[in-house]
């Protein structure tokens, strides 16, 4: 008996061939001997089966002695043995229909788990293997689970169902809802305007939810909410904003915040959370602000940075086009009695300058 595997919702074509290459009478029946479909001259005839409006054939093939049974919009319960009667002979085809679905939404938050469930006909014993977009393979029976989804898990999952040495392939598109970056650092000189951007790693037609930016300033003992906002169909509206600092927010995606000026008291780290409608859990992005200030007080030239800097960052003071006068893995450096000229304060990481502030030292008479 020939075995054919089908996918729920798809169309399958079961073949039946006569030795005579001409249009002759044929019938397709199910295992209960209920007529599904047949022919009368150039026309189809249909029986009282539950497949009635989903069954078809190809009249164009009849005069070649081919009498296929086409079943559209397959259901698991269509799994059965189908019998083609033509020229006093019977051809049997066993159809097994499988379905593979994500048991929750296919749009999942980063860190959540994905469960894929296989629907299969009674009596079948299939095995399933799925390959994630990043090439990770998982195997299982009726259910497959992946915990702690990552951004790289977004995309098409390809799952192969094996039964009777036959296979059928499913493709499931999974969208991991997350920000493009888990964390970002903005380096600014004191007084400069600060732009925070929170691009999303996914696109959906309608995006609705609410969000908030909590900020922990380095100098403050506790964190505070800087801004709360709503998101409706990709349109952003501010609900509440602190008076100090008075943040501004863009009305369109990507989420965009502007701090009028970088000040030492704002240096620190924030956490932007976004709760999406009909989703449990929130999206998070950490954002850090490092502020630099260069000052000259009497005979002391000082350069300071505030905010979350890594211990390997180097802070230097140097006269333009000269070697660094002072270079330390600290958050403040200074030079006593600096020479006249343009001094540069540099914050660097392995030779790469992250932040630079220039200050002119005038000659003393």
């Amino acid at each position: 008996k020939k075995v054919v595997l089908g996918k729920k919702g798809d169309t399958v074509e079961l073949t039946c061939t006569a030795s005579q290459k001409k249009s002759i009478q044929f019938h397709w029946k199910n295992s209960n001997q209920i007529k599904i479909l047949g022919n009368q001259g150039s026309f189809l005839t249909k029986g009282p089966s539950k497949l009635n409006d989903r069954a078809d054939s190809r009249r164009s093939l009849w005069d070649q002695g081919n009498f296929p049974l086409i079943i559209k919009n397959l259901k698991i319960e269509d799994s059965d043995t189908y019998i083609c009667e033509v020229e006093d002979q019977k051809e049997e085809v066993q159809l097994l229909v499988f379905g593979l679905t994500a048991n929750s939404d296919t749009h999942l938050l980063q860190g959540q788990s994905l469960t894929l469930t296989l629907e299969s006909p009674p009596g079948s014993s299939p095995s399933v293997q799925c390959r994630s977009p990043r090439g990770k393979n998982i195997q299982g029976g009726k259910t497959l689970s992946v915990s702690q989804l990552e951004l790289q898990d977004s995309g098409t999952w390809t799952c192969t169902v094996l039964q009777n040495q036959k296979k059928v392939e499913f493709k499931i598109d999974i969208v991991v809802l997350a920000f493009q970056k888990a964390s970002s650092i903005v380096y600014k000189k004191e007084g400069e305007q600060v732009e925070f951007s929170f691009p999303l790693a996914f696109t959906v037609e309608k995006l609705t939810g609410s969000g908030e930016l909590w900020w922990q300033a380095e100098r403050a003992s506790s964190s505070k909410s800087w801004i709360t906002f709503d998101l409706k169909n990709k349109e952003v509206s501010v609900k509440r904003v602190t008076q100090d600092p008075k943040l501004q927010m863009g009305k369109k995606l990507p989420l965009h915040l502007t701090l009028p000026q970088a000040l030492p008291q704002y240096a620190g780290s924030g956490n932007l959370t976004l709760a999406l409608e009909a989703k449990t859990g929130k999206l998070h992005q950490e954002v850090n602000l490092v502020v630099m200030r260069a000052t000259q007080l009497q005979k002391n030239l000082t350069c300071e940075v505030w905010g979350p800097t890594s211990p390997k960052l180097m802070l230097s003071l140097k006269l333009e086009n000269k070697e660094a006068k002072v270079s330390k893995r600290e958050k403040a450096v200074w030079v006593l009695n600096p020479e006249a000229g343009m001094w540069q304060c540099l914050l660097s990481d392995s030779g790469q300058v992250l932040l630079e502030s220039n200050i002119k030292v005038l000659p003393t008479w």
Epitope: G41, S42, F43, T45, N52, D53, D56, R59, S60
Partner: antibody
Framework: QVQLVQSGAEVKKPGASVKVSCKAS????????INWVRQATGQGLEWMGW????????GSTQKFQGRVTMTRNTSITTAYMELSSLRSEDTAVYYC??????????????WGKGTTVTVSS | EIVMTQSPATLSLSPGERATLSCRAS???????LSWYQQKPGQAPRLLIY???TRATGIPARFSGSGSGTDFTLTISSLQPEDFAVYYC?????????FGGGTKVEIK
């Protein structure tokens, strides 16, 4: 050109039979089906059945089974439809139409002008 | 059998207007199996469209057909004086072949 020419109008008494002819020309008669469709005055079209002139195989709707007979004479490329046990509700215009199977499509592309059959006592 | 229902029964329009005729099947049919015919008073029907959207030989481009499943449409983009007639849809998904009750397109 391809045409189907039907026999003239008929007046019949209830219980009688009528035989309508349909002469085909301009194409290979045995390569296409002949369908029979009727239309009562002011009413829509009603398909009665079909005949394959090559094999002589026929089929009709349940409504006409046992009352309709479709035959052909290939030598004179003519198809016939005989309806027996006539009743007043059989009063209609009877059309023959050529049936074309082209790939998976089936359609009636050439029609006769119709034969009016009146059943009256 | 499959019942074909056409609407509206009558459509009153002026020449140059667009006509949209609807045909609904009592069960889903393949779009390959739907035809449209035009019939003028005292004349035999004339094939317009087969396979739900393919124009028959010699049929002007202003006639177009569309649809799938149970809902099909015949559109006449700009009515000409010779288009005022009765239009029938017909299915041959399976026996018996059945026609819709017709839509009469009349001059307003």
């Amino acid at each position: 050109q391809v045409q189907l020419v039907q026999s003239g109008a008929e007046v019949k008494k209830p219980g009688a039979s009528v035989k309508v002819s349909c002469k085909a020309s301009g194409y290979t008669f045995t390569s296409y089906d002949i369908n029979w469709v009727r239309q009562a005055t002011g009413q829509g079209l009603e398909w009665m059945g079909w005949m394959n002139p090559n094999s002589g195989n026929t089929g009709s709707t349940q409504k006409f089974q046992g009352r309709v007979t479709m035959t052909r004479n290939t030598s004179i490329t003519t198809a016939y439809m005989e309806l027996s046990s006539l009743r007043s509700e059989d009063t209609a215009v009877y059309y023959c139409a050529r049936g074309v199977l082209k790939g998976d499509y089936y359609y009636m592309d050439v029609w006769g002008k119709g034969t009016t059959v009146t059943v009256s006592s | 059998e499959i019942v074909m229902t056409q609407s509206p029964a009558t459509l009153s329009l002026s020449p140059g207007e667009r006509a949209t005729l609807s045909c609904r099947a009592s069960q889903s049919i393949s779009s390959s199996y739907l035809s449209w015919y035009q019939q003028k008073p005292g004349q035999a029907p004339r094939l317009l469209i087969y396979g739900s959207s393919t124009r028959a030989t010699g049929i002007p481009a202003r006639f177009s057909g569309s649809g799938s499943g149970t809902d099909f449409t015949l559109t006449i983009s700009s009515l000409q004086p010779e288009d005022f007639a009765v239009y029938y849809c017909q299915q041959d998904d399976h026996l018996p072949l059945t026609f819709g009750g017709g839509t009469k397109v009349e001059i307003k």
